[in-house]
C-alpha cells in the first residue's frame, strides 16, 4: 500500500514535468531505493543541478525566455568546480551567454535568479569587463587564458547555457 | 553640438565599389557605438551595419554580410562603410547614426543628413 | 527576424486633434518591464528624428504632444494635439535582438 501511493505521487510529479521534458533520465540518490533524482534528457548533471547548451543563436533576453519556458534560467555560476563541469561540455570555438547581466550599465552585475553577485567568486577574462554598452555575459575560450567569462552586447545572437534544479521523484 | 555628416555617395555599375564616410563632431566619438542605416526610395528604414565603440565588434545583416565592411577612426573621429559587389538593391540614401544603449538594447539619438547611393547600368 | 507592422499606413488630421499610430511587433519586445521599442519622424528630405525611446520615454527638446506607450507586441506613438509642423512619416524601431528593425511607416498629414 505504501509503495503503491509511492508510486502514484511519482506519476502525477512526472505528469507534471511531462509539457516540456518528455523524458527524464533519473539516478538513486544513495542507498534509499525511495530517493531518485532526475534531469531532463540529455540534460547532463551536476551536483544539485541539470545543464542544457543551447545551440541555437538568440539574444541574451531570447535565451533567458527560452531558458525559463523549460522550467529553466539561464546559467548562475556559483563555484570554479562548477564552472570546470560545464565547459567539459563547450564548444572552443563558441560564445555562451551566462545568466549575468548589467541592464543599466552602470557595472553592477546582477544573476537571473536574484543569487548575489561575488566578485570573489568571478571567472572574468583578464581586461574584462571592459565596455558600458555590453551588458550580459557570455563564456568562452581564449587561447593565453582558456575559458572565461566577457561582456558583450545583449541584442547580438550567440548559444547558452541553461540551468535548473534537479527534479527529485 | 552633435554633428554627423555623411560624404562619399554617387553612382556606381553593379558589381562596383564605394567608400562612404561619417565625420563626427560634438561629442566623445570613441565613447559611442555607431551605424549605418538605410533608406531606399518610397521604403521602410533597414538597419545596414554596426560597429561598438571600442572597435572590437562589427555587425551586419544577411542582405549586406561578406559585401559591405564598417570601420572606425577614433584619431579623425570618423566613420566608414567600404561597400563592394554593389547590387541595384543597395540603391537607397546611407544615414550615418549614433547608438545610445539602454537596459537590453539601444536606439539612434542622432543621424546624418544622409548621403546617396545609386546602383545602375 | 522581428517583423515591425504599422497602421494605419497614412492618416489625416485636422490641427488639435489626437493622432494615433500603433505598431505591432511579431513578437514581444519586452523584458522584466524594459520596451525596447523606439519611435522616430521624419521629415520629407530630412533624416529620422528620435522623438520617444523604450516605449514612453519623451527624448530631450521634444514637444510634450508626443507621448508613446504600450507593451509585449502592441505599441502606440500619440500626437495630441497635433500641430502643422507634425506632417511627417513616423516609424516605429525594436533593438530587443539583432537585427534592428524598422516599422514601415505612418504618414500623417494635417487637414
Known amino acids: 500500500n505504501f509503495m503503491y501511493s509511492k508510486t502514484v505521487k511519482r506519476l502525477s510529479k512526472l505528469r507534471e514535468y511531462q509539457q516540456y521534458h518528455p523524458s527524464l533520465t533519473c539516478v538513486m540518490e544513495g542507498k534509499d531505493i525511495e530517493d531518485w533524482s532526475c534531469c531532463p534528457t540529455p540534460w547532463t548533471s551536476f551536483q544539485s543541478s541539470c545543464y542544457f547548451i543551447s545551440t541555437g543563436m538568440q539574444s541574451w533576453t531570447k535565451s533567458q525566455k527560452n531558458c525559463s519556458v523549460m522550467g529553466a534560467d539561464l546559467v548562475v555560476i556559483n563555484t570554479r568546480e562548477e564552472q570546470d563541469f560545464i565547459i567539459q561540455n563547450l564548444k572552443r570555438n563558441s560564445s555562451y551567454f551566462l545568466g549575468l547581466s548589467d541592464p543599466g550599465g552602470r557595472r553592477h552585475w546582477q544573476w537571473v535568479d536574484q543569487t548575489p553577485y561575488n566578485e570573489n567568486v568571478t571567472f572574468w577574462h583578464s581586461g574584462e569587463p571592459n565596455n558600458l554598452d555590453e551588458r550580459c555575459a557570455i563564456i568562452n575560450f581564449r587561447s593565453s587564458e582558456e575559458w572565461g567569462w566577457n561582456d558583450i552586447h545583449c541584442h547580438v545572437p550567440q548559444k547558452s547555457i541553461c540551468k535548473m534544479k534537479k527534479i527529485y521523484i | 553640438e552633435v554633428q554627423l555628416v555623411e560624404s562619399g555617395g554617387g553612382l556606381v555599375k553593379p558589381g562596383g565599389s564605394l567608400r562612404l564616410s561619417c565625420a563626427a563632431s560634438?561629442?566623445?566619438?570613441?565613447?559611442?557605438?555607431m551605424s549605418w542605416v538605410r533608406q531606399a526610395p518610397g521604403k521602410r528604414l533597414e538597419w545596414v551595419a554596426t560597429i561598438s565603440s571600442g572597435d572590437s565588434y562589427t555587425y551586419y545583416p544577411d542582405s549586406v554580410k561578406g559585401r559591405f565592411t564598417i570601420s572606425r577612426d577614433n584619431a579623425k573621429n570618423s566613420l566608414y562603410l567600404q561597400m563592394n559587389s554593389l547590387r541595384a538593391e543597395d540603391t537607397a540614401v546611407y544615414y550615418c547614426?549614433?547608438?545610445?544603449?539602454?537596459?537590453?538594447?539601444?536606439?539612434?539619438?542622432?543621424w546624418g543628413q544622409g548621403t546617396t547611393v545609386t546602383v545602375s547600368s | 527576424d522581428i517583423v515591425l507592422t504599422q497602421s494605419p499606413a497614412s492618416l489625416a488630421v485636422s490641427p488639435g486633434q489626437r493622432a494615433t499610430i500603433t505598431c505591432r511587433a511579431s513578437e514581444s519586445v519586452s523584458f522584466h518591464g524594459t520596451h525596447l521599442m523606439h519611435w522616430y519622424q521624419q521629415k520629407p528630405g530630412q533624416p529620422p528624428k528620435l522623438l520617444i525611446y523604450?516605449?514612453?520615454n519623451l527624448e530631450s527638446g521634444v514637444p510634450a504632444r508626443f507621448s508613446g506607450s504600450g507593451s509585449g507586441t502592441d505599441f502606440t506613438l500619440t500626437i495630441n494635439p497635433v500641430e502643422a509642423e507634425d506632417t511627417a512619416n513616423y516609424y516605429c524601431q525594436q533593438s530587443i535582438e539583432d537585427p534592428p528593425t524598422f516599422g514601415g511607416g505612418t504618414k500623417v498629414e494635417i487637414k
Open positions: 560634438g561629442f566623445t566619438f570613441s565613447s559611442y557605438g
Open positions: 523604450a516605449a514612453s
Open positions: 547614426a549614433r547608438q545610445l544603449y539602454y537596459s537590453y538594447g539601444y536606439y539612434f539619438d542622432y
